[in-house]
Interface confidence: low
């Protein structure tokens, strides 16, 4: 339905508070280096303009598209060329090329200082002094560091952030109340950002069809009682929502997400029996709850899949009539029967089925040709099952930190050209799959583990894309979205890699390591481990373990010493010499 003024339409639909928050998120995700005050000024100008359009939709410029209005506003930033370099060239383009240009300059790893959490009393004072500015600053800081964060979900996080401060700043022990809540929001926020980044990568790198296939599989697992046509409608609407958010159209995205939540709740009876509680919540909580809702129970009387998709003599005719709909039905029917499979596995099965039909429907005897197609699924199913079994056993044996170290060594040997910070970040996250998924029963392990690994490997892919250094990473990241994990799993030690020159500075540590948190200390040690492997890629597990044990003992000893700095200098030299000898450096 066409509106005379798009900006007035969205302002009225979303309300002033959400409108301002979403425009701030959009601007911060585009211009990630701009100071907070500059963004607030731009947002206020856009908001005042929107109000004039609400009052009179025929007023000057009110008929312009949101991209035109927002792009024009961003291009008024005086320091655009100094701060952003070639991004300023976007402003010479016309829409829609200008918006595409801004999107291409989004930086997944912006050069921004780490967010340091102030003292609780300082935060509470700031919160009480100016709640609105405090919350806006939260949106700004998250959005600029996570340029693909799902904007309507960030509003939900901000609501929880506000609730935490409202409750805890008047508690007897503010810190005990607030810090666990902030830790939880930080961890959930990072996970949410990474999940959304995969959705955007799926749409932008592999296209709408790939995203829709993912959505059919996931929604069919979640809503196995819903008809195929119902699932298809939800997939179409969900694809629109995520296409908009990934494209920077945050107002439309938030508006359409609210409409989708409304539709789902109005049609619960034909979708899922698990939605009742979600649908009683306010909008932001409702949308979040629906996105996380548990799988409904499978209908009891589902017939065998083989009848429609293998035994039927009409398979090729049905496939030819409407290929994507027929494959969509196959994926829907398979996924609703298999909540125990990962989405990526289901997509691999559907791809195998499609490839078989393409080949067999052109054969002399199609039915004879595709009769055994389900047998081809067996190895595809067993591969992730075995991998998860082995890795969960290793995790249970080692614990999270040492399991991460095993993965650090494994991945550094596979792709040693990748930067050390990226290898540490990605391997630490890969290692978290253990505590996240291995506790689950068999039936829930694979969807938990493999779909989580898809999210983490996508982080590697987007970080690597910014500065490509490894053909192997590029190959695994670009060839097939659903085969990324098997592709990385199959990589062996890179025999072409020339070991890094030894640099003593890399292994020089100072007393500041003693004041770090346990997590930061682990990262320091893991950084050293990656560097060791880059110097000596053929080092055995035993050699590396011996050096790491010595390193841990060295840090512990020097942190207990009276003159810590001297200890680090002297003992450090000994450790480096001993390590070189142990590894033959």
């Amino acid at each position: 339905d066409a509106h005379k003024s798009e900006v007035a339409h969205r302002f009225k639909d979303l309300g002033e508070e959400n409108f301002k928050a979403l425009v701030l998120i959009a601007f911060a995700q585009y211009l990630q280096q701009c100071p907070f005050e500059d963004h607030v000024k731009l947002v206020n100008e856009v908001t005042e303009f929107a109000k004039t359009c609400v009052a009179d939709e025929s007023a000057e410029n009110c008929d312009k598209s949101l991209h035109t209005l927002f792009g024009d506003k961003l291009c008024t930033v005086a320091t655009l060329r100094e701060t952003y370099g070639e991004m300023a060239d976007c402003c010479a383009k016309q829409e829609p090329e200008r918006n595409e240009c801004f999107l291409q300059h989004k930086d997944d790893n912006p050069n921004l200082p780490r967010l340091v959490r102030p003292e609780v009393d300082v935060m509470c004072t700031a919160f009480h002094d100016n709640e609105e500015t405090f919350l806006k600053k939260y949106l700004y800081e998250i959005a600029r560091r996570h340029p693909y964060f799902y904007a309507p979900e960030l509003l939900f996080f901000a609501k929880r952030y506000k609730a935490a401060f409202t409750e805890c700043c008047q508690a007897a022990d503010k810190a005990a109340c607030l810090l666990p809540k902030l830790d939880e929001l930080r961890d959930e926020g990072k996970a949410s950002s990474a999940k959304q980044r995969l959705k955007c990568a799926s749409l932008q790198k592999f296209g709408e069809r790939a995203f829709k296939a993912w959505a059919v599989a996931r929604l069919s697992q979640r809503f196995p009682k819903a008809e195929f046509a119902e699932v298809s409608k939800l997939v179409t609407d969900l694809t629109k929502v995520h296409t908009e958010c990934c494209h920077g159209d945050l107002l439309e995205c938030a508006d359409d997400r609210a409409d989708l939540a409304k539709y789902i709740c109005e049609n619960q009876d034909s979708i899922s029996s698990k939605l009742k509680e979600c649908c009683e919540k306010p909008l932001l909580e409702k949308s979040h709850c629906i996105a996380e809702v548990e799988n409904d129970e499978m209908p009891a009387d589902l017939p065998s899949l083989a009848a429609d998709f293998v035994e039927s003599k009409d398979v090729c005719k049905n496939y030819a009539e409407a290929k994507d709909v027929f494959l969509g039905m196959f994926l829907y029917e398979y996924a609703r029967r298999h909540p125990d499979y990962s989405v990526v596995l289901l997509l691999r099965l559907a791809k195998t089925y499609e490839t078989t039909l393409e080949k067999c429907c052109a054969a002399a005897d199609p039915h004879e040709c595709y009769a055994k197609v389900f047998d081809e699924f067996k190895p595809l199913v067993e591969e992730p099952q075995n991998l998860i079994k082995q890795n969960c056993e290793l995790f249970e044996q080692l614990g999270e930190y040492k399991f991460q170290n095993a993965l650090l060594v494994r991945y550094t040997k596979k792709v040693p050209q990748v930067s050390t910070p990226t290898l540490v970040e990605v391997s630490r996250n890969l290692g978290k799959v253990g505590s996240k998924c291995c506790k689950h029963p068999e039936a829930k392990r694979m969807p938990c583990a493999e779909d989580y690994l898809s999210v983490v490997l996508n982080q590697l892919c987007v970080l690597h894309e910014k500065t490509p250094v490894s053909d192997r990473v590029t190959k695994c990241c670009t060839e097939s979205l659903v085969n990324r994990r098997p592709c990385f799993s199959a990589l062996e030690v890179d025999e072409t890699y020339v070991p890094k020159e030894f640099n003593a500075e890399t292994f020089t540590f100072h007393a500041d390591i003693c004041t770090l948190s346990e997590k930061e200390r682990q990262i320091k040690k893991q950084t050293a481990l990656v560097e060791l492997v880059k110097h000596k890629p053929k080092a055995t597990k035993e050699q590396l373990k011996a050096v790491m044990d010595d390193f841990a003992a060295f840090v512990e000893k020097c942190c207990k010493a009276d003159d810590k700095e001297t200890c680090f200098a002297e003992e450090g030299k000994k450790l480096v010499a001993a390590s070189q000898a142990a590894l033959g450096l």
Epitope: F228, S232, T236, N318, V325, M329
Partner: nanobody
């Protein structure tokens, strides 16, 4: 909620014509291929005809080729089946479906060809 409502059926003499309609709602009609299937008394479902999402590509079962024409109007979210030269063996309940699906929606519309 997804709804497909068939209409236009009735009693017609052999050689006569009917035009069936299927009004669709609750999903993005223009994004999907659609089909007509039918079920004769005491028989299983039989696929009749299919059309792609844009209306350019149409398919027919051998038994109706040259007599039936499938079409669609995406602006009205409606699927049609023009049936000419009707025969007694065309007597059935006709259903429209999304894609070519074993599931069916709506009540169907009954076509009886008899003198």
């Amino acid at each position: 909620e997804v709804q497909l409502v068939e209409s236009g059926g009735g009693l017609v003499q052999p050689g006569g014509s009917l035009r069936l309609s299927c009004a669709a709602s609750g999903f993005t009609f223009g994004s999907f291929g659609m089909s007509w299937v039918r079920q004769a008394p005491g028989k299983g479902l039989e696929w009749v005809s299919a059309i792609d999402s844009g209306g350019a590509d149409t398919r027919y079962a051998e038994s109706v080729k040259g007599r039936f024409t499938i079409s669609r109007d995406n602006s009205k979210n409606t699927l049609y089946l023009q049936m000419n030269s009707l025969r007694a063996e065309d007597t059935a309940v006709y259903y429209c479906t999304i894609g070519r699906s074993a599931s069916r929606w709506g009540q169907g519309t009954t076509v009886t060809v008899s003198s």
